[in-house]
Every structure is written in C-alpha cells, then in structure tokens.
Interface confidence: low
C-alpha cells in the first residue's frame, strides 16, 4: 500500500478547521475490516486518531479530530482537525496498514492574522520640530511572530531607534508592540507595517504630524 500526502504544509487559521490530506489506493475487494489507520504526532508518536478492527476508534487528541468515514473505503484517510490552536502546529504522520503498510507525514502550520495597528504618540501635544517623540505601533492576536517595518512619508525605511516586543497570550497568539523614537521634522508621516510571514498579510498603521492636530 502506498500512502500519499500533500508535500506543502497545510496552513490553518486559529479557530478554523483544517484537513490533513492522506490517501491510499485500495486493492479490489478491499474492506474496512482490513484497515488499520493511525494518525499520530510525528515527533512524539502521540496517538491522534485511529481506525482499527473495522471501526473508528475516535479521537485521542483533545476530542477535536475526525475522519471521513464514508470516504475511507475509497482510500481517503484524511484527518479533520477542528478549532485549530497554536499548539496543534507540527508534523502529523498518517500510517496505513492493510496487508503491508506505509506512512507519510504532513505538516500543519498554524496562523492568525494581525489586527490593524493602533498608533500612539508620546508626548502627544505641544510638539515642535526637533522634539524627540515616541511612536508606538500595536497590533494584536497574530501568529506566528510578526515582522515589523517602519517608513517615513517618502517611503524610506526607518531602522534606527526601533524596539519591537512580542508577547504571547494564553492561546499562544502574539501581541506586537513596536516603538519608534524619532526627532520631528517640520511635518511628516510615520507608518508601520505589521506582516504575518506565513499569511503574507500586511496590516498598516500611520500617524501624520503637521503641527496640530495629529492625524491617525
């Protein structure tokens, strides 16, 4: 028996359902009573889901997995993972045994988009050209860690005096806070871009300083 899986990682958004595709080619006369199907975590060999002795043995992994029972006889051994979490990320092995056996691994990459950045300025009044100001760009609930880029109004990258911190919450999602310290010109726009490297999703925020008032 030959097992086939997707070579590309499966990208799943947090809290959505993901399908880890796995298939085999059943011989003529194949019956489910002959099938042993095991899904396990590749690294730790922890059992995730199994089909043995002619029946679905159910989820062994937080009760969020399911097979496609009506499609098994056709050779579809795919696994449905519900309400994906950050901690689900990793490699899963599909092991199929009928008379002989084969296995293959598929990778799950979890992702979550970052929110539109909010911009704050300190100090936020009585600003004068030549003043040092701190601009903070905050974006929330993304995964994996973000790439943060700052640019001025002419699109020139600002790399000096930038401090970026990213903190994971209890769900493993990151809140990113990037701080730019800059000396004000006569006027100017400062923009931050928060990029999710997996989703290639960009979230933009900007602040324009034109004396008074401020534009966000």
């Amino acid at each position: 028996v030959e097992v086939q899986v997707s070579e590309d990682p499966v990208v799943a958004l947090v809290d959505t359902d993901a399908t880890l595709r796995c298939s085999f080619s059943p011989e003529p006369g194949f019956s489910l009573a002959q099938l042993n199907l095991i899904w396990q975590l590749t690294d730790t060999k922890q059992l995730v889901h199994s089909f043995t002795e002619g029946r679905d043995q159910g989820s062994a992994y937080s009760n969020r997995t399911a097979l496609f029972p009506d499609l098994l006889v056709q050779g579809n051994a795919s696994l449905r993972l519900q309400r994906v979490r950050v901690t689900d990320e990793g490699s899963y092995t599909c092991f199929v045994s009928i008379q002989d056996f084969d296995s293959a691994a598929v990778s799950l990459q979890v992702a979550a988009p970052y929110s539109k950045p909010s911009m704050t300025l300190e100090p936020n009044k009585d600003l004068r050209p030549g003043n040092m100001v701190t601009i903070t760009c905050s974006s929330y609930q993304g995964y994996p860690e973000a790439e943060v880029f700052w640019k001025d109004g002419q699109g020139v990258p600002l790399t000096g005096n930038v401090t970026t911190s990213q903190m994971a919450n209890e769900r493993g999602l990151f809140d990113v806070h990037s701080v730019l310290r800059v000396v004000l010109g006569a006027n100017g726009t400062y923009s931050c871009l928060v990029r999710n490297p997996v989703l290639q999703q960009d979230a933009h925020g900007s602040v324009t300083i034109t004396g008074q008032p401020l534009t966000f």
């Epitope: 730790t44 922890q46 950050v86 901690t87 990320e89 994996p144 860690e145 973000a146 790439e147 943060v148 970026t164 911190s165 990213q166 903190m167 994971a168 919450n169 209890e170 493993g172 490297p197």
Partner: antibody, heavy 122, light 108 residues
Framework: EVQLLESGGGLVQPGGSLRLSCAAS????????MSWVRQAPGKGLEWVSS?????????YYADSVKGRFTISRDNSKNTLYLQMNSLRAEDTAVYYC??????????????WGQGTTVTVSS | EIVLTQSPGTLSLSPGERATLSCRAS??????LAWYQQKPGQAPRLLIY???TRATGVPDRFSGSGSGTEFTLTISSLQSEDFAVYYC??????????FGGGTKVEIK
C-alpha cells in the same frame, strides 16, 4: 552530538558588567528559540530571557533583569549571548543556556549547557 | 504571572518505591507543563513535556498526568539514579516562563 557550551562567567563587582556566550553545535542553531535560565546558590531555576528564531530576533526578559540584561544571537556563529549590565548581588547564580523544543515560541527546553557561574560581590 | 507550587519539598523514599510529585498552578495552564530532573552539579534534564509526553531517552518508569491546575509526576519504581531534584515548568502564559520551587527526592 547536540551541545551547548557557556562561557564568560566570573567575579564582578556590583554595578559591573559581564557578557556570557553560549556556543551551539550539533544542530541547526537558527531553527530554535534559545533561552537563558539561572540558578542562585541553593535555589531553584529562574527563567531570565529568551530570543526568537528570526523576524529580527524578538526578545523576552524576566522583570528582574529588564533594562539591565540584553539577549542576542549570531546565527552565523551559532552563538547566543547575554550582556549583563548594572549587576547586583542577587544576580549571583549559575547561568544556563538552553534550547527550546519549539521553533515558534517558548515552551520546554530539551538541551542545556553545563552552566557558567557569575558571582557579584565587592 | 503564573505561580507553580510543588509539593512536597522533600520526599524520602527507598529504591524500588513509587514516587508521586505534585505541581499546582495558580491558574489553568491546560496541559502546557514540563518536568525536569536535576542532579547536584549538573544541568537540568527535560523529562516530560505537554504534561504526559516523555522526552527522548527518558525511561518509561517516569510518567506525567493532570491538566488545568493540578499535575503529577510519577516514578513507578525508584532507581538509584532517580534521586535528584525535580522541577515543573509552565509555558501556557509567557513571558515569564515560570518554574516550581522543586521537589527533592532523597534516599530514605
């Protein structure tokens, strides 16, 4: 063989500085989160700092060292660093370099160095 | 910050006996818990992660259980090399990563 080897510890006066290094070998250093964990004499383990694999190397610090310690990495040299400034007596400890199991976030640490001793005393 | 409380502080047992070590979290950490073993003069060694999964090379006499706020490390039959200090560590909410205060398993 997967290995971490710390160096740079020693005796320093309060207010002084030290830079610890951790040389990694036997694995792809750039693929792993790395951390520093310390252990004061006769005490338990205390997490100090961690650094992510990429995206500029996002850094994390315990409140007790924030603003004084700086973690960094040089993936081309397979080396992790901890720059320690404004040292205090309570920073006296064995400092361990550790590799995280996960490339994506701090979880559990499966490879540890042998530790390097930092003593802050006048 | 999540506080981990280990008990007992010291466990005095004989080789061959069963050791049960407890770790309690100040709030739920789901199953995001690891256990480490440390012998005098040595670095910690990862034993268990994700509450129940043994790290590579760890004998099956070590097992972990629990979820939420209550966790247990069990050593089914103590061997001479198992006498050491054991630490739990959570990674559910970080920074900071936090460790328990440790349980010393000593020879009775």
């Amino acid at each position: 063989e997967v290995q971490l080897l710390e160096s740079g510890g020693g005796l320093v006066q309060p207010g002084g500085s030290l830079r610890l290094s951790c040389a990694a070998s036997g694995f792809t250093f750039s693929d792993y989160y790395m951390s520093w964990v310390r252990q004061a004499p006769g005490k338990g383990l205390e997490w100090v700092s961690s650094i992510s694999i990429s995206y500029g190397g996002t850094t994390y610090y315990a409140d007790s060292v924030k603003g004084r310690f700086t973690i960094s990495r040089d993936n081309s040299k397979n080396t992790l660093y901890l720059q320690m400034n404004s040292l205090r007596a309570e920073d006296t400890a064995v400092y361990y370099c550790a590799r995280d199991r996960s490339p994506y976030q701090c979880r559990s640490m499966d490879v540890w160095g042998q530790g390097t001793t930092v003593t802050v005393s006048s | 910050e999540i506080v981990l409380t280990q008990s007992p502080g010291t466990l005095s047992l004989s080789p061959g006996e069963r050791a049960t070590l407890s770790c309690r979290a100040s709030q739920s950490i789901r199953s995001d818990l690891a256990w480490y073993q440390q012998k005098p003069g040595q670095a910690p060694r990862l034993l268990i992660y994700n509450t129940v999964t043994r790290a590579t090379g760890v004998p099956d006499r070590f097992s972990g259980s629990g979820s939420g706020t209550e966790f247990t490390l069990t050593i089914s039959s103590l061997q001479s090399e198992d006498f050491a200090v054991y630490y739990c560590q959570q990674y559910n909410s970080w920074p900071p990563l936090t460790f328990g205060g440790g349980t010393k398993v000593e020879i009775k």
